[in-house]
């Protein structure tokens, strides 16, 4: 029967009594940079080409003896995973092994970066079709080893990596904390975050989905038809390595950005125990376990968008957070929250030609963060429209007015410590969606953006006695862009975008009367691209 | 991410004038930074990752190199060029006392140093 | 491009050995193994084991009850069958074919077993 | 070990007609099957893999199906050079074992 790894990142139309998806990935060249395989093993026999790359370190310990079947271990099982006939996700992909870890299962950041480098070169040499990198390792947190995959990054390659398996922050380590690679954590058989002795997976902002992780059957080097259980980040970051085969082999031309977004958008939503996470890396971590796409094509009417948290601003009074988009990416909104309450808003600016999302912390705050809602919208020019504070009963507004502009995102930032503590909430005046509406004493600012087809809609949700957390959720064939609070509320923690839900959270409402002060209204931003799908039919 | 991540150590050695005259002096104002594995067991001193600015060739690259060599030599100190990259980053891996950072740090096109460290299988 | 090529025809007493050799070319050997397959004069095709270049292991079929001994030689991409204490019934043409998929056969050699 | 059951032993037909060739085996094997033409005094040639991926270089005409236990290999439309002994072999489990052979004879 199918290993439940298989069926679990299989769509429903996919499943039979075996695992054969339509094209498997035939047109995509994987690299697989890990310890030495055994290539002739009958699970992989002719799809792995073994370089001649070795850049490994001596084994620890005198007494070490190399036995080849252990020496192999690690990769076998990983290009099993990946491409295996059997147990395979991407059973037509082919592979390129780079040894860069020894018969332990070590390596260094510079064997890595000449292996990286050795890609590059051979990508030069001989150009093939899409690439795939996938880095089954970790280390501590390295400028130089992330600075190298941002470069592979950028000339085309996708680069897929283990989280890690320290039960940690994933931002820790490297290559998971490039923000150019896809990074992968564990989950199991009931979509929860994998335990690994006294550890686990990593979790964190750093990490963009899960995937099977536990008790992954694939080819074992102890003999050329065995088979062997493993379990581990690295066998995650396998099964995206492999997904994103069968993605690229179905659609070549996908960019590292759109091949990203889609892996979000076919994950499994929301059914992971966060529970496992700490508290405060909770709201971090993303609720996604990998799939495949149910169709491999025809995705590409959908307006794509993800979210992106910064790292912690710290908690000096003038510290700000940061959150980027990739290169291909638009920011449509930005969005600030702070565990404490304190904070003093968030703003979109332009840094090096590119809009970011900054969030400001507040005196006696603990500390910021960004959120960065990063959307696939092509031919877009967005721009953001900024109204000073009124000083106006009416609290301060700022719409779109340039012609075939929409209102995708709105971010408030405000200089004063506390803003409007005990002062009634502003209502916002209905019937004018394309309009920004924030507290009299806050700057507002608009993302405001025309793109062939595209059309927005607001919507919102109050609850008028204190909840700590209310949500609005766009609907179907519509994507969520913007996610903010009306003003006025002062015990609003922030807001956040989680797939299509705006999420604005609130203080503890033990701490809070149940006054008007008590009411809040989650503000959503709906989008969709009526030129995208127009496209796609085209296409079909 | 940014470097504002938790654990990283970061080590800015400020640049001081010293006795050798460098033909290519670093521009003014700028200091090269160095950086090594907040996690102490799995720091591997003694190999160094010498990056260089973006924009820099091979040829300098080599030369950066063995520049480094010839300084360290006149100081005593024997050092080994084991790798010198270009296509993804230009820099070169090179085997040395730490002793020698503080001139390493100064030597045209540096960017940053990178004390090397381990990675392991997941 | 790919192929195995065997070497020659043997005629042997029962109770002799034979050494048959298969030298691949036009591919990366460590990529696959080596299957030995068998045919009797009128029979179908029997499977005699498999030998690895890679690191030399070897599967073989319980038939032969530790008479066969398959091995490979890396530097040379030769890959031996050696069949010991032969029978009459080891009469037959053995074929060498890549990996387990046998997706390329050799020419085959007949090996001739009579008094 | 794994019994491969062919049908039909042999088989008369003329060129032109579709032919077809069935494979049972003794457990579920997935997809790990080959089919495999051979000539008289030549080494087989693989036609198909995995059930149903025809070779590179392979006419067509030759087409696989099936996935468990039961396999089918299918000729369309019988050429002269078609005329051959047939084998399957499952290589989901060691030993990997091969059918009796089905042989194609002229009418």
């Known amino acids: 029967s199918i290993p439940w790894n298989l069926e679990r990142i299989t769509p429903p139309r996919y499943r039979a009594d075996e695992y054969q998806p339509p094209d498997g990935g035939s047109l995509v060249e994987v690299y697989l940079l890990d310890t030495s395989i055994q290539s002739d093993h009958r699970e992989i026999e002719g799809r792995v080409m073994v370089t001649d790359f070795e850049n490994v370190p001596e084994e620890d310990g005198t007494r070490f003896h190399r036995q080849a079947s252990k020496c192999d271990s690690h990769g076998t099982h990983l290009a099993g995973v990946v491409s295996g006939r059997d147990a395979g996700v991407a059973k037509g992909a082919s592979m390129r092994s780079l040894r860069v870890l020894n018969c332990q299962g070590k390596g260094t950041v510079s064997g890595t970066l000449i292996g990286l480098e050795f890609i590059r070169k051979s990508q030069l040499v001989q150009p093939v079709g899409p690439l795939v990198v996938l880095l089954p390792l970790a280390g501590g947190y390295s400028r130089v080893l992330n600075a190298a995959c941002q470069r592979l990054a950028r000339a085309g390659v996708v680069l897929v990596t283990a989280a890690g398996n320290f039960r940690d922050d994933a931002c820790l380590y490297s290559p998971a904390s490039a923000p150019e690679v896809i990074t992968v954590g564990a989950t199991n058989a009931q979509d929860q975050p994998v335990t690994l002795g006294t550890l686990g997976t990593n979790f964190g902002r750093c990490v963009d989905l899960f995937a099977p992780g536990e008790d992954i059957i694939g080819a074992s080097s102890d003999c050329s038809t065995c088979f062997v259980s493993q379990s581990g980040t690295s066998q995650a970051a396998a099964h995206v390595a492999g997904i994103a085969a069968m993605m690229l082999s179905a659609e070549p031309e996908l960019t590292l950005a759109e091949l990203r977004q889609r892996l979000i958008h076919f994950s499994a939503k929301d059914v992971i125990n966060e529970a496992w996470f700490p508290e405060d890396q909770r709201v971090l971590t993303p609720n996604l376990v990998a799939a495949l796409p149910p169709s491999t094509h025809g995705a590409g009417w959908q307006l794509f968008c993800r979210t992106v948290w910064s790292a912690h601003s710290g908690p000096t009074r003038m510290a700000t957070a940061v959150a980027r988009c990739a290169p291909d990416e638009e920011l449509l909104s930005c969005s600030s929250f702070s565990r404490s309450g304190k904070r003093r808003g968030e703003r979109m600016e332009a840094q090096g030609g590119k809009l970011v999302c900054r969030a400001h912390n507040a005196f006696g705050g603990e500390g910021v963060y960004a959120i960065a809602r990063c959307c696939l919208l092509p031919q877009a020019n967005c721009s953001v429209h900024t109204a000073p504070p009124a000083e106006a009963s009416m609290g301060t507004r700022v719409h779109c007015h340039q012609q075939g502009h929409v209102l995708t995102g709105c971010s408030s930032h405000w200089e004063v410590e506390d803003l409007g503590t005990h002062k009634p909430p502003v209502l916002r005046p209905r019937g004018q969606p394309n309009q920004c509406v924030g507290h009299r004493e806050a700057s507002i600012h608009a993302s405001c953006c025309h793109a062939p087809g595209l059309e927005c809609k607001v919507k919102e949700h109050g609850i008028p006695a204190p909840q700590e957390q209310v949500t609005v959720a766009c609907e179907e064939g519509w994507t969520l862009t913007g996610c903010s609070a009306l003003p006025g509320t002062s015990h609003v923690l922030g807001a956040y975008a989680v797939d299509n839900t705006c999420v604005v959270r609130s203080r503890d409402v033990s701490t809070t009367g149940s006054t008007s002060e008590g009411a809040v209204t989650a503000v959503a931003i709906c989008c969709r691209s009526r030129h995208l799908a127009q496209a796609s039919q085209e296409l079909q | 991410q940014e470097d504002e991540d938790g654990d990283y150590e970061e080590l800015v050695l400020a640049l001081r004038s010293e006795e050798d005259g460098l033909a290519e002096a670093p521009e003014h104002g700028t200091t090269a930074t160095f950086h090594r594995c907040a996690k102490d067991p799995w720091r591997l001193p003694g190999t160094y990752v010498v990056v260089l600015k973006e924009e820099t060739h091979l040829s300098q690259s080599e030369r950066t190199a063995r520049r480094l060599q010839a300084q360290a030599a006149r100081r005593g100190y024997l050092t080994k060029i084991l790798h010198v990259f270009h296509g993804l980053l230009p820099g070169f891996l090179v085997k040395m006392s730490g002793d020698l950072l503080e001139l390493a740090l100064k030597l045209p096109h540096v960017d940053y140093i990178e004390e090397d460290s381990s990675v392991f299988a997941q | 491009q790919v192929q195995l090529v065997q070497s020659g025809a043997e005629v042997k007493k029962p109770g002799a050995s034979v050494k048959v050799s298969c030298k691949a070319s036009g591919y990366t050997v460590t990529s696959y193994g080596i299957s030995w397959v068998r045919q009797a004069p009128g029979q179908g095709l029997e499977w005699m084991g498999w030998v690895s270049f890679y690191n030399g292991n070897s599967n073989y079929a319980q038939k032969l009850q530790g008479r066969g001994t398959m091995t490979t030689d890396p530097s040379t991409s030769t890959a031996y069958m050696e069949l010991r204490s032969l029978r009459s019934d080891d009469t037959a043409v053995y074929y060498c074919?890549?990996?387990?998929?046998?997706?390329?056969w050799g020419q085959g050699t007949t090996v001739t077993v009579s008094s | 070990d794994i019994q491969m059951t062919q049908s039909p032993s042999s088989l008369s037909a003329s060129v032109g007609d579709r032919v077809t060739i069935t494979c049972r085996a003794s457990?579920?094997?997935?997809?790990?099957l080959n089919w495999y033409q051979q000539k008289p005094g030549k080494a087989p040639k693989l036609l198909i893999y995995?059930?149903?991926s025809r070779q590179s270089g392979v006419p067509s005409r030759f087409s696989g199906s099936g996935s468990g236990t039961d396999f089918t290999l299918t000729i369309s439309s019988l050429q002269p050079e078609d005329f051959a002994t047939y084998y399957c072999?499952?290589?989901?489990?060691?030993?990997?074992?091969f059918g009796q052979g089905t042989k194609v004879e002229i009418k």
């Open positions: 457990q579920n094997i997935n997809s790990w």
């Open positions: 074919a890549r990996g387990y998929s046998l997706d390329v």
């Open positions: 995995g059930a149903s």
């Open positions: 072999q499952q290589w989901f489990d060691v030993p990997t074992t």
